[in-house]
Amino acid sequence: EEELQVIQPDKSVLVAAGETATLRCTATSLIPVGPIQWFRGAGPGRELIYNQKEGHFPRVTTVSDLTKRNNMDFSIRIGNITPADAGTYYCVKFRKGSPDDVEFKSGAGTELSVRAKPSAPVVSGPAARATPQHTVSFTCESHGFSPRDITLKWFKNGNELSDFQTNVDPVGESVSYSIHSTAKVVLTREDVHSQVICEVAHVTLQGDPLRGTANLSETIRVPPTLEVTQQPVRAENQVNVTCQVRKFYPQRLQLTWLENGNVSRTETASTVTENKDGTYNWMSWLLVNVSAHRDDVKLTCQVEHDGQPAVSKSHDLKVSAHPKEQGSNTAAENTGSNERNIY
């Protein structure tokens, strides 16, 4: 009779992560008597996957009933496949021996490849805020996918970006892969409502790419513009001075009034108004008692925005002359007001 051959008909098998892999193996003869074992790999490190004779293999089931005397089908199923299960699997026939069974013949091996979906892309921006006209970097990461081929695109408000660099690791063969991409984005004053999107397409996603987003509101700082104006006289000896703080983001802002360099009042922006572009406006009033001053008064509106160095705008209040409306003529915007009479 012809010597037993171990046949593994499939050179390779491709399975999606989470599914069951079927590894086929048949013997051409019932002789010699002895068990079949399945291994992953060859040589000293080969890992026992299934032993017909003994052991506990919770993820492995046999395709046929191996207890039947005339059985020659030694195929197995491995459940809940993960990328870590990838490798070459060998079906090995042992000859019954004493005290130990002896390896008799091995199949040619079946390479199990695992298709695994990429994880949801995670987009992260710079640690510190940046101002318009500056270029900032965003990173996008996705892990655990297989095979290695993957496509990554960047968008800002639906417009595809071109200034980015992408790496897929590792470079060589692996059970699963990771992608890391860094995109450069130039900020504009209108970016408070903008979004940066990282889109990942992979064969396992069946044309439905995964997206990760970052809001530029977490990244941008729009510094305020200041305008100090003197309003018409309220009473014979009182002048109303306003400081318009316009187009700033984020809201965190502290305003200090100085009279001739001395702190008069400090307040925090609270009842702000929001512009269409997501920036904020705010207005603070200062009521100055002119009769309390013999000389001209230099009024300064000093603003500290989002922990940045203070910016200020000054206004000279003429005491000698009859107070009249002074200041710049920039178009007013919707503003909130905050009136405090300090006298």
């Epitope: 790999g41 490190g45 890992e47 996957i49 090995v92 130990d100």
Partner: antibody, heavy 117, light 108 residues
Framework: DVQLVESGGGLVQPGGSLRLSCTAS????????MSWVRQAPGEGLEWVSA???????YYTDSVKGRFTISRDNSKNTLYLQMNSLRAEDTAIYYC???????????WGLGTLVTVSS | EIVLTQSPGTLSVSPGERVTLTCRAS??????IAWYQQKPGQAPRLLIY???SRATGIPGRFSGSGSGTEFTLTITSLQSEDFAVYYC??????????FGGGTKVEIK
């Protein structure tokens, strides 16, 4: 957590014998290849012997016929019986778990074998 | 037997520097190379396998590359804890499994 603990090292005269043990925990011992790797004082690493998940044994040429690797799966223990020891066998002997594609993913802290008269 | 030759034998570097270690095989090994780190008085620790796959828990500053007979281990920004001896090992041919002679990375 995978743990490998070697024991049995010591001082032995040339021509003498020693038996090293490695007790494993944290994984299904019977399913995996196990190996001995040694390191002579101030030298590099040298693979000595291995026992596969099926019990097949492998040796480097310099120890064939003198060293015997074995395992007791019921005790999760790997052994290395070393006979006809020579001065050049002096080394730290590490027990290591072998992955399915033949590299070493976990190592014990090692046991020192000194062969000297 | 596959012989692995590591170069240089010793490398003197400052923390923060980029380090590249080389391992050459006497024949093609199909990318089956592993890298280990060993600190004085400690057991080796697996860093890289299959030439470029990072082992569990290994920081991203360690990376492996190469194919055929020439392989490299790169440490992008050397930390104080990275000063050690680095060994390559081929896991292509198990008769026998072989290691390189090691590269010592020491403080400049």
């Amino acid at each position: 957590d995978v743990q490998l603990v070697e024991s049995g090292g010591g001082l032995v005269q040339p021509g003498g014998s020693l038996r090293l043990s490695c007790t494993a925990s944290g994984f299904t011992f019977r399913n995996y290849g196990m190996s001995w790797v040694r390191q002579a004082p101030g030298e590099g690493l040298e693979w000595v012997s291995a026992s596969s998940g099926s019990g097949s044994t492998y040796y480097t040429d310099s120890v064939k016929g003198r060293f015997t690797i074995s395992r007791d799966n019921s005790k999760n223990t790997l052994y290395l019986q070393m006979n006809s020891l020579r001065a050049e066998d002096t080394a730290i002997y590490y027990c290591a778990k072998v992955t399915w594609n033949n590299f070493f993913d976990y190592w014990g802290l090692g046991t020192l074998v000194t062969v000297s008269s | 037997e596959i012989v692995l030759t590591q170069s240089p034998g010793t490398l003197s570097v400052s923390p923060g520097e980029r380090v590249t270690l080389t391992c050459r095989a006497s024949q093609g090994i199909a990318g089956k190379i592993a890298w280990y780190q060993q600190k004085p008085g400690q057991a080796p620790r697996l860093l890289i396998y299959d030439a470029s796959s990072r082992a569990t828990g290994i920081p991203g500053r360690f990376s492996g590359s190469g194919s055929g007979t020439e392989f490299t281990l790169t440490i992008t920004s050397l930390q104080s804890e990275d000063f050690a001896v680095y060994y390559c090992q081929q896991h292509y041919d198990w008769s026998p499994l072989t290691f390189g002679g090691g590269t010592k990375v020491e403080i400049k």
